[in-house]
């Protein structure tokens, strides 16, 4: 019985991002007896649940029941009915909820509680549904790429795990972009900070770390287009707007109801005399860009060095990893590849702009048009964001690495969320045991 | 367009049962979920019970245990097994079929249909 492998002990746990568009559930499972050591836990399911974000259930609550049922019952089929009761299920909500909350914290608690009381239905251990805050957000997502991609693994290896890892020790940032927010994370090169506000520390497995992040609410992809033509709806002549973030010949009418409906708005909130407009696309990537630079101040700096809107950004270091809607649409765009200079992206990003909206419903005949109408202006916002925003260069933007997952697992805030709460990474480094016991008899 | 027709509302006394029979005709394919209503005289119309593509259900905490949510692909018929009715069972209940949105934009449901409604009373 020397080598026989006993069955191995294996633990789950379910977190549920309830994003601005829609919610996803992840499943992790990771060995019992290996719980402290890095890089074990690893993503068996994704789940996304039809329909979008739960702040749109707010005058709904009674259905969200039924709108997180489906991705429930497939976490009670995918994990054993023996693991049931000690699978931590954990909800994070992000900016959509934020902006809820600034809306009305009592609306926003009432989806919560709704939330919570359909989760606690099922036989798992819920731990609860809470509003994450957007420094969270981008912390936990820096956790996450990093324990993927094994940089806080004291072990160096001679061979690489994943594309992105080279023997060092040194952290990728993490730059996440959503629906309502977008993150930036990093370790920069001096340990001092100017804005305490932006300045995490943390020790993990015996070493520490000086992070800055921060969350820009309001600069996700849709709240930005919210924003962009909230700004320039305010100086059309008349109910028509001439739109060079859209695809020549695309024509869409919107409600000024649903414009100002966001708090991302209200800056640019004025009486219009209509209650509709119609974008009329122009496909000008230049003057996307220029449009898109607005949204952004740069004029006021408290600090040495500013992002934009006097948010303070030390100076960039390192490799980076881009996910979410970074990766999500530059993926769609073909341009996630790493020999793809920032240059060449731009030129490609003008091409796609000006194509015909009719060539791109035929090119792209199974997307969604509501989703394929936005690329243009979400890559010309991306690179506004990683340019202008965040100051990267066409020599940094070799540093950027576009990533959808990392080793089966989602880049994103949620499983670095479950390794803290369920307390999977240590402060100090975990003494390494020659052979687990448990392997073999 | 899909169109939804009730059957099997009526009077029933306390505790006994009540079996509502919904079918739908017309487009649908573009319907992932499909549910049960009522509303009683001067309340707003609450959902009682709902059950997904998938065949999975949900529950009203006022029905729960008590009624039973089910669907026939086959027969395109979405059903409501009533047990132990009490007199606050009293409305009218509409069978509903919708698909949400995956828009932040809009309205929250995609597709949206509703039947007539069929009375349900509950006395002695």
């Known amino acids: 019985t020397q080598n026989k492998a006993l069955p191995e002990n294996i633990k789950y746990g379910i977190v549920l991002d309830a994003g601005s568009s829609h919610t996803s559930l992840y499943i992790y499972k990771w060995p019992a007896e290996k719980e402290n050591d890095t890089g074990v836990v690893h993503q068996v399911e994704e789940c996304r649940v039809k329909g979008p974000g739960i702040s749109k259930y707010v005058q709904k609550v009674n259905e969200i029941g039924i709108y997180l049922t489906d991705c429930m019952e497939r976490a009670r089929e995918v994990i054993p009915r023996s693991q049931h009761q000690e699978t931590p299920v954990y909800l994070g909500a992000t900016a959509g909820m934020r902006l809820l909350r600034m809306e009305s914290e009592e609306l926003a608690d009432r989806v919560l509680d709704v939330v919570e009381r359909s989760l606690s239905n099922y036989p798992f251990d819920f731990q609860g549904a809470r509003i994450i805050t957007g420094q969270e957000e981008g912390a936990y997502g820096w956790i996450t790429i990093n324990y993927l991609l094994g940089k806080f693994s004291q072990k160096t290896r001679w061979f690489s795990i994943v594309p992105y890892e080279t023997n060092n020790q040194e952290t990728f940032g993490a730059l996440d972009l959503g629906g309502a927010s977008t993150q930036i994370t990093f370790v920069p090169q001096n340990q001092t900070t100017e804005s305490p506000d932006n300045a995490l520390q943390f020790r993990l497995y015996g070493k520490d770390y000086n992070v800055y992040t921060h969350s820009f609410l309001c600069y996700g992809k849709d709240q930005a287009l919210w924003q962009k033509l909230a700004k320039d709806i305010q100086v059309a002549s008349n109910e028509i707007l001439r739109d060079p973030c859209f695809h020549p010949g695309y024509k869409k009418v919107v409600n000024v109801s649903d414009l100002y409906k966001t708090p991302c708005t209200k800056r640019f909130e004025m009486t219009l005399p209509f209650q509709q407009f119609e974008i009329q696309g122009i496909g000008n990537y230049q003057q996307c860009h220029q449009s898109v630079l607005e949204l952004f101040n740069t004029s006021y700096c408290p600090y040495s060095q500013c992002a934009f809107n006097g948010i303070f950004l030390p100076p960039l270091q390192g490799d980076f990893g881009a996910f979410s809607a970074f990766y999500f649409v530059m993926n769609f765009l073909n341009l996630t590849s790493e020999k793809v200079s920032q240059e060449k992206v731009t030129e490609m990003m003008k091409k796609f702009c000006s194509q015909p909206w009719e060539e791109i419903k035929t090119s792209y005949a199974g997307v969604k048009e509501k989703y394929l109408s936005e690329y243009c202006f979400s890559g010309t916002y991306i690179l506004s964001l990683l340019l202008q925003g965040y100051h990267f260069t066409a020599d940094s933007w070799e540093h950027i690495h576009f990533i959808g997952k990392i080793q089966g697992s989602d880049a994103g805030w949620t499983l670095g969320y479950m390794l803290n709460l369920t307390n999977m990474i240590p402060a100090e480094q975990p003494l390494s045991t020659p052979l687990s016991h448990s392997t073999y008899v | 367009e899909v169109q939804l027709l009730e059957s099997g509302g009526g009077l029933v006394q306390p505790g006994r049962s009540l079996r509502l029979s919904c079918a739908a005709s017309?487009?649908?394919?573009?319907?992932?979920?499909m549910g049960w209503y009522r509303q009683a005289p001067g309340n707003e119309r609450e959902l009682v019970a709902a059950i997904t593509g998938r065949g999975n259900t949900n529950y009203a905490d006022s029905v729960k245990g008590r009624f039973t949510i089910s669907r026939d692909n086959s027969k395109n018929t979405v059903y409501l097994q009533m047990n132990s009715l009490k007199p606050e069972d009293t409305a009218v209940y509409y069978c509903n079929a919708w698909d949400y949105s995956d828009y932040d934009e809009g309205p929250l449901r995609e597709y949206d249909y509703w039947g007539q409604g069929t009375q349900v009373t509950v006395s002695s």
């Open positions: 017309g487009d649908i394919f573009s319907i992932n979920y």
